[in-house]
Interface confidence: low
Amino acid sequence: AVNGTSRFTCFYNSRANISCVWSQDGALQDTSCQVHAWPDRRRWNQTCELLPVSQASWACNLILGTPDSQKLTAVDIVTLRVMCREGVRWRMMAIQDFKPFENLRLMAPISLQVVHVETHRCNISWKISQASHYFERHLEFEARTLSPGHTWEEAPLMTLKQKQEWICLETLTPDTQYEFQVRVKPLQGEFTTWSPWSQPLAFRTKPAALGKDT
């Protein structure tokens, strides 16, 4: 038998993916475990194999359909169970009534690009990926810029309190290499959390023109 404290956390990407992490103190590394998803209002169910991500935690992605298909709504409940094999039978290790739109974590923004760059400013745009149409404009963003000699953790956060898929970075240093990241969060959901950070976008400000103060 597998004993110890269990933690089972899942997030819905708002379209067709539920990502789960199960951690179990004292769990056996060679135990075969799965996540089973049984929606209360749908004619499908789904399973994914939990794969180890650390000594005592496993993760998997429930792929519910094509990436942009709207597989769940705000009134869906999905019963999620962690099932682990014990010899010839399966034992339920964890269960939760999962409310998808209370537990949202969107995909990281994509297609970051420099729209326009000058000596002291840079206009950057991005797109959200696989985000439900249900949100309409009810999204917010956080962005951060990596300056030379600093770490991402030291970068101040810029908050965009509306669905604005661009930003104009100001007061930059001329002829300097920067990196930029953005993440997104729906306003809906008690346990909703920020998406992962986007892939960093590297850009360089233009050099200052000689003899001019730009």
Partner: antibody, heavy 119, light 106 residues
Framework: EVQLLESGGGLVQPGGSLRLSCAAS????????VHWIRQAPGKGLEWLGV???????DYNAAFISRLTISKDNSKNTVYFQMNSLRAEDTAVYYC?????????????WGQGTLVTVSS | DIQMTQSPSSLSASVGDRVTITCQAS?????MYWYQQRPGKAPRLLIY???NLASGVPSRFSGSGSGTSYTFTISSLQPEDIATYYC?????????FGQGTKVEIK
């Protein structure tokens, strides 16, 4: 065969509390949500709330302050408790379950239990 | 809350007649359900997911619609169809029902 059997109805004083039971057979309440719906005499149907298979609940906001739905998995029974009853709570109270394709509407209903709120 | 408005509230038709009941939602819904309730009995599910016939329900019953407008039809009214019929939405909480349509035989 799926069956739902309500009990606990009867006469209740205004301001009093009501506790109903819904005994399920033919399925497990750890696998399906159980809903409560009521019908006042000569009136339509009103959804009150649900307890899901894992124990979480959703309530009609109009009743959230005085309604509690709970269950005992070992007895395969769901409980409905409403406080601060008034005359307009007089109704037949039903428990119901969705169909086998899960959420295919209320495919299974109890026979209902009549609650009369009167002094 | 989404209000469900059924019409007519009552109707009288002859055996063999085609009977149509409409249900108008105050905002768009994705799933519509129809129930039959005979006097003194619990409701019985007839139609789920707008147009699917529940198990054991005769094929003379049907449903259609989308958005805010839905229709329930009895293609050939039978004596045993005397009942009150309710629509119900299952798209947002609280789940809500129409006020009912009482069907009688002329």
């Amino acid at each position: 065969e799926v069956q739902l059997l309500e009990s606990g109805g009867g006469l209740v004083q205004p301001g009093g509390s009501l506790r109903l039971s819904c005994a399920a057979s033919g399925f497990s309440v750890t696998s399906y949500g159980v809903h409560w719906i009521r019908q006042a005499p000569g009136k339509g149907l009103e959804w009150l709330g649900v307890i899901w298979s894992g124990g979480s609940t959703d309530y009609n906001a109009a009743f959230i302050s005085r309604l509690t739905i709970s269950k005992d998995n070992s007895k395969n029974t769901v409980y409905f408790q409403m406080n601060s009853l008034r005359a307009e709570d007089t109704a037949v109270y039903y428990c119901a379950r969705a169909g086998d394709a899960n959420y295919d509407g209320f495919a299974y209903w109890g026979q209902g239990t009549l609650v009369t709120v009167s002094s | 809350d989404i209000q469900m408005t059924q019409s007519p509230s009552s109707l009288s038709a002859s055996v063999g007649d085609r009977v149509t009941i409409t249900c108008q939602a105050s905002s768009s819904v994705s799933f519509m359900y129809w129930y039959q309730q005979r006097p003194g009995k619990a409701p019985r599910l007839l139609i789920y997911d707008t147009s699917n016939l529940a198990s054991g329900v005769p094929s003379r019953f049907s449903g259609s619609g989308s958005g805010t407008s839905y229709t329930f039809t009895i293609s050939s009214l039978q004596p045993e169809d005397i009942a009150t019929y309710y629509c119900q939405q299952w798209s947002t909480y609280p789940l809500t029902f129409g006020q009912g349509t009482k069907v009688e035989i002329k």
